[in-house]
Amino acid sequence: CKAMHVAQPAVVLASSRGIASFVCEYASPGKATEVRVTVLRQADSQVTEVCAATYMMGNELTFLDDSICTGTSSGNQVNLTIQGLRAMDTGLYICKVELMYPPPYYLGIGNGTQIYVIDPEPCPDSDF
């Protein structure tokens, strides 16, 4: 297993609709054809997997149907979007990139993006 540098923004504020997008960029040392991207959430000392996708270079990322993540790739950059976020989901989201094929296997983990989520103000009751 070889180490690889992964860069991601330090802080992002999600939209009022609970959507946060950020780029995860990795310094690929070779010509990988198969890449796996995993988003991890760290809260206190607990780390949980948010979503993961494996893609072939040049193809779209495919997350599971019920995943809260979507993404696109361009070269060594992956543009990740996490939706359905609530205020309680505020936390550190870490991008993990694995170059699966061809060998050698490379692993890179970013410093994390602190995502802040603001619950929208409830709409005032309307008199209908």
């Epitope: 923004p9 802080v11 504020l13 802040y116």
Partner: antibody, heavy 118, light 110 residues
Framework: EVQLVQSGAEVKKPGASVKVSCKAS????????ISWVRQAPGQGLEWMGW????????NYAQKLQGRVTMTTDTSTSTAYMELRSLRSDDTAVYYC???????????WGQGTLVTVSS | SYELMQPPSVSKGLRQTATLTCTGN????????ADWLQQHQGHPPKLLSY???DRPSGISERFSASRSGSTASLTITGLQPEDEADYYC???????????FGGGTKVTVL
């Protein structure tokens, strides 16, 4: 070296607006946020709101909602805070602070004194 | 009024130990912890301690932070004249969707 340099002192009349700038250097501006904090004479620190330089999204303190606007110009790595309908109790030193990894206010500007007086 | 409660002042002798407290609730300090800032008269605040109780580089080991439940503490050992300053705690409040400050504690070194 990370630096946040703010614009100079301002004297304004009640009802007017003020726009304070905060020019950042020494880091990738769009990877971080900028928070604004004010301090009235002899008082403690009050959080006003923040902007994510990455996407321009903002989050304002409830009590200032509707009177404050925070923006960034990523081409010059500068953040702005505009406060409207100024009152005498808005007299304060206004600070910008970088919101860093983990959401820490890790670097601060030197402060801008805004005096509201008729 | 401040969401986080800090004693207004603490006085200790030279080379003594001062412990500052910051009490919040489960939405702020109890949830994420608190950061500590030091502010000398006429200067901007400076980050002293991260909410995970680590120190930024360049901050003396004499400053150490801890947390128990919804109360964060900052301990200053071997007090020096230059430690005379205002100390603020700061936390993200998940229910207010806002950062909240404590009212500050003025530390006097006798």
């Amino acid at each position: 070296e990370v630096q946040l340099v703010q614009s100079g002192a301002e004297v304004k009349k009640p009802g007017a607006s003020v726009k304070v700038s905060c020019k950042a250097s020494g880091y990738t501006f769009t990877s971080y946020g900028i928070s604004w904090v004010r301090q009235a004479p002899g008082q403690g620190l009050e959080w006003m709101g923040w902007i994510s330089a990455y996407n321009g999204n903002t989050n304002y303190a409830q009590k200032l909602q509707g009177r404050v606007t925070m923006t960034t110009d990523t081409s010059t790595s500068t953040a702005y805070m505009e406060l409207r309908s100024l009152r005498s109790d808005d007299t304060a030193v206004y600070y910008c602070a970088r919101v860093g990894y983990g959401g820490y206010f890790d670097y601060w500007g030197q402060g801008t004194l805004v005096t509201v007086s008729s | 009024s401040y969401e986080l409660m800090q004693p207004p002042s603490v006085s200790k002798g030279l080379r003594q130990t001062a412990t500052l407290t910051c009490t919040g609730n489960s939405n702020n300090v109890g949830n994420q912890g608190a950061d500590w800032l030091q502010q000398h008269q006429g200067h901007p605040p400076k980050l002293l301690s991260y909410r995970n109780n680590d120190r930024p580089s360049g901050i003396s080991e004499r400053f150490s932070a801890s947390r128990s439940g919804s109360t964060a503490s900052l301990t200053i050992t071997g007090l020096q004249p230059e430690d005379e300053a205002d100390y603020y705690c700061l936390a993200w409040d998940s229910s207010l969707s806002a950062w909240v400050f404590g009212g500050g504690t003025k530390v006097t070194v006798l």
